[in-house]
């Protein structure tokens, strides 16, 4: 008598999540009499997947009619496959008895489930950084299978190279996650820049998923300060201008100090945006020279986005009386800049 063979022809089957999987199994002989059962896994922890005789298996159906005389095909179809269904499936022949006795197992069919990665989520640094500093962005995507996946980073269309990517877990799993970190050097021109994390996977049919982050959320562009004194007016008033340029974000407070005392405080709001996304702001202070007997020390103090204040200071010399005062411009400086401005009563 020929020995019974349980034949599972496919060593492996790959199915997209949500689809149906067909697991093939045939036997070489109708004897001995007894049922076929399907298990996921082997050993004492194996799970019963299908037993024609008894049980309720709503997602599993027999491919051919198992009640048909001389049936030797015990293939099954599992519907609505999820990543949790991955594993090795065994078709097992039992001999009829009380209880039934396990006789022979097929070689097993490894079911792998193709699952799409979730939309990549890109997150940037918790606090803003200034231009010329490097910041890190992370990109995460989950739930994909198989493990092979490609992740690329772009800044304004140019691929980034300072990237570290990990796919977890390291071994075989039901599904996988990817986490990537890109280091980006900020420049003053990056307010309108964008980083893109692009994920390509076999399940996406060449149409990669993208996650984006705007560098405007990560960058702080500190202002340039320029102070100018206009020509002395006929009424002995000196017009001093504090120009604050090329800053981002808009959150800025400007304070004028006369001899160390607060003269006026202004908050920037509703400013027009420059082409590069930064902002400019100009503040004027009129100083009545004739009202002062001694020199006046003027300070333009700018506090940008909660950072330490930047000052520019000027001395208005009351003793001198030059009639036509030229335009005095302070060079860019982040510390304290003192200049002498001569004014008089005429």
């Amino acid at each position: 008598e020929e020995e019974l063979q349980v034949i599972q022809p496919e060593k492996s089957v790959s199915v997209a999540a949500g689809d149906s999987a067909t697991l093939n199994c045939t036997v070489s002989s109708l004897i001995p009499v007894g049922p076929i059962q399907w298990f996921r896994g082997a050993g004492p922890g194996r799970e019963l997947i299908y037993n024609l005789k008894e049980g309720h298996f709503p997602r599993v159906t027999a491919v051919s009619d198992p009640t048909k005389r001389n049936n030797m095909d015990f293939s099954i179809r599992i519907s609505n496959i999820t990543p949790a269904d991955a594993g090795t499936y065994y078709c097992v022949k039992f001999r009829k008895g009380s209880p039934d006795v396990e006789l022979k197992s097929g070689a097993g069919t490894e079911l792998s489930v193709r699952a799409k990665p979730s939309a990549p989520v890109v997150s940037g640094p918790a606090v803003r950084a200034t231009a010329e500093h490097t910041v890190s962005f992370t990109c995460e995507s989950h739930g994909f299978s198989p493990r092979d996946i490609t992740l690329k980073w772009f800044k304004n269309g140019n691929e980034l190279s300072d990237v570290q990517t990990n796919v977890d877990p390291a071994g075989k799993s039901v599904s996988y996650s990817i986490r990537s970190t890109a280091r980006v050097l900020l420049t003053r021109r990056d307010v309108h820049s964008q980083v893109i994390c692009e994920v390509a996977h076999v399940t996406l049919q060449g149409d990669p998923l993208r996650g984006t982050a705007n560098l405007s959320e990560a960058i702080r562009v500190p202002p340039f300060l320029e102070v100018t004194q206009q020509s002395m007016r006929a009424d002995n008033q000196v017009n001093v201008t504090c120009q604050v340029t090329k800053f981002y974000p808009q959150r800025l407070q400007l304070t004028w100090l006369e001899n160390g005392n607060v003269s006026r405080t202004e908050m920037a709001s509703a400013l027009p945006e420059n082409k590069d996304g930064t902002y400019n702001w100009t503040s004027w202070l009129l100083v009545n020279v004739s009202a002062h007997r001694d020199d006046v020390k003027l300070t333009c103090q700018v506090e940008h986005d909660g950072q330490p204040a930047v000052n520019k200071s000027f001395s208005v010399k009351v003793s001198a009386h030059p009639k036509e005062q030229g335009s005095n411009t302070a060079a860019e400086n982040t510390g304290t800049n003192e200049r002498n401005i001569y004014g008089g009563s005429g």
């Epitope: 896994g41 050993g43 922890g45 991955a86 594993g87 001999r95 006795v101 396990e102 071994g171």
Partner: antibody, heavy 122, light 112 residues
Amino acid sequence: QVQLQESGPGLVRPSETLSLTCTVSGGSIRNYYWSWIRQPPGKGLEWMGFIYDNGRTFYNPSLKSRVTISLDMSMNQFSLKMTSVTAADTAVYYCARVRAYSGIGLDGTDVWGQGTTVTVSS
Amino acid sequence: DIVMTQSPLSLPVTPGEPASISCKSSQSLLYSNGYAYLDWYLQRPGQSPQLLIYQGSNRASGVPDRFSGSGSGTDFTLKISRVEAEDVGVFYCMQALQTPLTFGGGTKVEIK
């Protein structure tokens, strides 16, 4: 090539809980049983229990009330917790991979960690 | 629980000579599918155990062919055709048919 690495404290006080973790590298958790086996000084091997990739656990009845084995597939790790330890629990603790290819039985414990020595003492 | 009994407890051997270790189980390890779920392990001094034989007679990957397993039901034997110096250590049999998995007490093999 699959490697297993046990980690956890080398000294545990009597009546406290022993906690060990085994990290699986270079291979899959799927389709295997993940076992804890211990060896008291100068003695033989004692199987404590294992967990299958589907989370089903099996324990040695002599320890069952005190032992819990859990699996973290995302971290490629499995863990052992044993409560109310005594000096008799002093041993080298091994984590190991058990194969299952056919039927209800098992087909060899083919990968072992290097073992971690746990001493129970006050 | 299935009780595993090994003999001898200690086995002095001469390199190049054959050696044999016996393992008996308190109940049959032969399952209805025809497989005998018995493993053999070698634990060299200071090392973790290593799988030699599974299902009674199947050599594990990388195990030299001087090791062979035989037996069925309750009586099993591990044979070493020509002992080498690296074979010293403790040999254990283990039943893998049902939980709790149980080990024999071990056979210590040492060079004469």
